[in-house]
């Protein structure tokens, strides 16, 4: 059986939309599937790599690599999206291309970034971990770390940095899929909202879904002990 909840929820474009949340009900009137997984149920994607989930994550990453920051022209906010999902008339899509990106490092101004921009994250404004020396962030946003400390400046002069961010990574469903969503939408969908991250590639949703002890490598499920827990 399914339990359907419908509610008006604030979505990425800043408008309220009617959203359906479908929950698979437990036939025995007990915990939900997500709760059972958290409690240690035999759920194979938490024990070993699941090809289907792996391909979903790779597909999400490929899409994210090509994303940019969609900044609303009315200054109502910004969100990381694909160009096709960013209004050409109501918003500005900030994407580095044709030599408009910042240099990879101050030692070599000629080598420009082509991957980005990212809403609220920029190698020029992140102090920790700083993109410098032997630790230059790669020219692939899906390999960027989470910035834990921004430069102390209320205005950077960058469109994608000075806007109010409207969405962050949200881990939804037992498949460990990730979407950039508003907090409201994420909570309604019973997802896990990552306040600290800007990109889905910075979070490991399956690790969150499985719970218990974190994976040794967040990319590789290793909870073999589930076989004895349940």
């Amino acid at each position: 059986a399914q339990h359907v909840t419908t509610q008006l929820v604030l979505r990425n474009k800043g408008v309220y939309e009617s959203v359906k949340y479908i929950q698979q009900e437990n036939f025995w009137i007990g915990p939900s599937s997500i709760d059972l997984i958290h409690l240690g149920a035999k759920f194979s994607p938490c024990i070993r790599k699941d090809q289907q989930i792996e391909q979903l994550v790779l597909r999400e990453r490929d899409l994210e690599r090509d994303s940019g920051c969609c900044v609303q022209n009315d200054h109502s906010g910004c969100i990381q999206t694909q160009r096709k999902d960013c209004s050409e008339t109501l918003a500005t899509f900030v994407k580095w291309q044709d030599d408009t990106g910042p240099p990879m490092d101050k030692s070599d101004l000629g080598q420009k970034r082509t991957s980005g921009a990212v809403c609220h994250q920029d190698p020029r404004t992140c102090e920790e971990p700083a993109s410098s020396g032997a630790h230059i962030w790669p020219d692939d946003i899906t390999k960027w770390p989470i910035c834990t400390e921004q430069a102390k400046s209320n205005r950077t002069g960058f469109l994608h940095m000075d806007c109010q961010i409207k969405g962050r990574p949200c881990c939804i469903s037992t498949k460990g899929s990730c979407e950039i969503t508003t907090r409201e939408y994420c909570e309604f969908m019973h997802g896990y909202f990552h306040e600290e991250a800007t990109l889905c590639s910075q979070v490991h949703c399956l690790d969150k879904v499985c719970g218990l002890l974190p994976f040794l490598n967040p990319e590789v499920p290793d909870q073999f002990y589930r076989l004895w827990l349940s």
Partner: antibody, heavy 120, light 107 residues
């Protein structure tokens, strides 16, 4: 409010070494993404970038003059010092210090400049 | 090094006129170009960054455009206080280089 002020001799003799000091306020050179550098302008001519020093002590010099230039900073005193060896009459110019940022590698604040004449 | 060439070297214009100053780079520099204004006996002042982005406190009559090798600084409805020399600067690669300047005289 950001201010920069250059100081140094108004007159130097050929072959001598010029030492210029930039004293600034309103920001710290330990602040991430900031640098201070020197640009000169011979009378009635274009601007020429000489050197920059960054918050992390990275230094960059104009290759055409690199062998003659040395830039250093004293963060506690809010000062940047530039020395130019083997001065020549063609080095006669107004020398400016300016703040630079890695945000766009442009100079957002400048000092008023100091005119240095090289003559025997 | 990248050579920046401005034109014209000198321009005499009347107030309220629209003025355009061009800057050409010896190689493509994307949008990594900035404009400065230098009034007589004063230090340069940043007007425009990244070819077209305005700087706070700079009058809106100043605007920039262009990418690649050709850039333009436009002053809409010139005012007497705009009498100055205008320089472009590239930050595409070291060493940072400037144009030779365009002197604007008000008739």
């Amino acid at each position: 409010q950001v201010t920069l002020r250059e100081s140094g001799p108004a007159l130097v003799k050929p072959t001598q070494t010029l030492t210029l000091t930039c004293t600034f306020s309103g920001f710290s050179l330990s602040t991430f993404a900031l640098g201070v550098g020197w640009i000169r302008q011979p009378p009635g001519k274009a601007l020429e970038w000489l050197a920059h020093i960054w918050w992390d002590d990275d230094k960059y010099y104009n290759p055409a003059l690199k062998s003659r230039l040395t830039i250093s900073k004293d963060t506690s005193k809010n000062q940047v010092v530039l020395t130019i060896t083997n001065m020549d009459p063609v080095d006669t110019a107004t020398y400016y210090c300016a703040r630079i940022t890695t945000y766009y590698y442009g100079m957002d604040y400048w000092g008023q400049g100091t005119l240095v004449t090289v003559s025997s | 090094e990248i050579v920046m060439t401005q034109s014209p070297d000198f321009q005499s214009v009347t107030p309220k006129e629209k003025v355009t100053i061009t800057c050409r780079a010896s190689q493509s520099i994307g949008n990594h170009l900035h404009w400065y204004q230098q009034k007589p006996d004063a230090s340069p002042k940043l007007l425009i960054k990244y070819a077209s982005q305005s700087i706070s406190g700079v009058p809106s009559r100043f605007s920039g455009s262009g990418s690649g090798t050709d850039f333009t600084l436009t002053i809409n409805s010139l005012e007497a206080e705009d009498a100055a020399t205008y320089f472009c600067q590239q930050s595409y690669q070291w060493p940072l280089t400037f144009g030779q300047g365009t002197k604007l005289e008000i008739k």
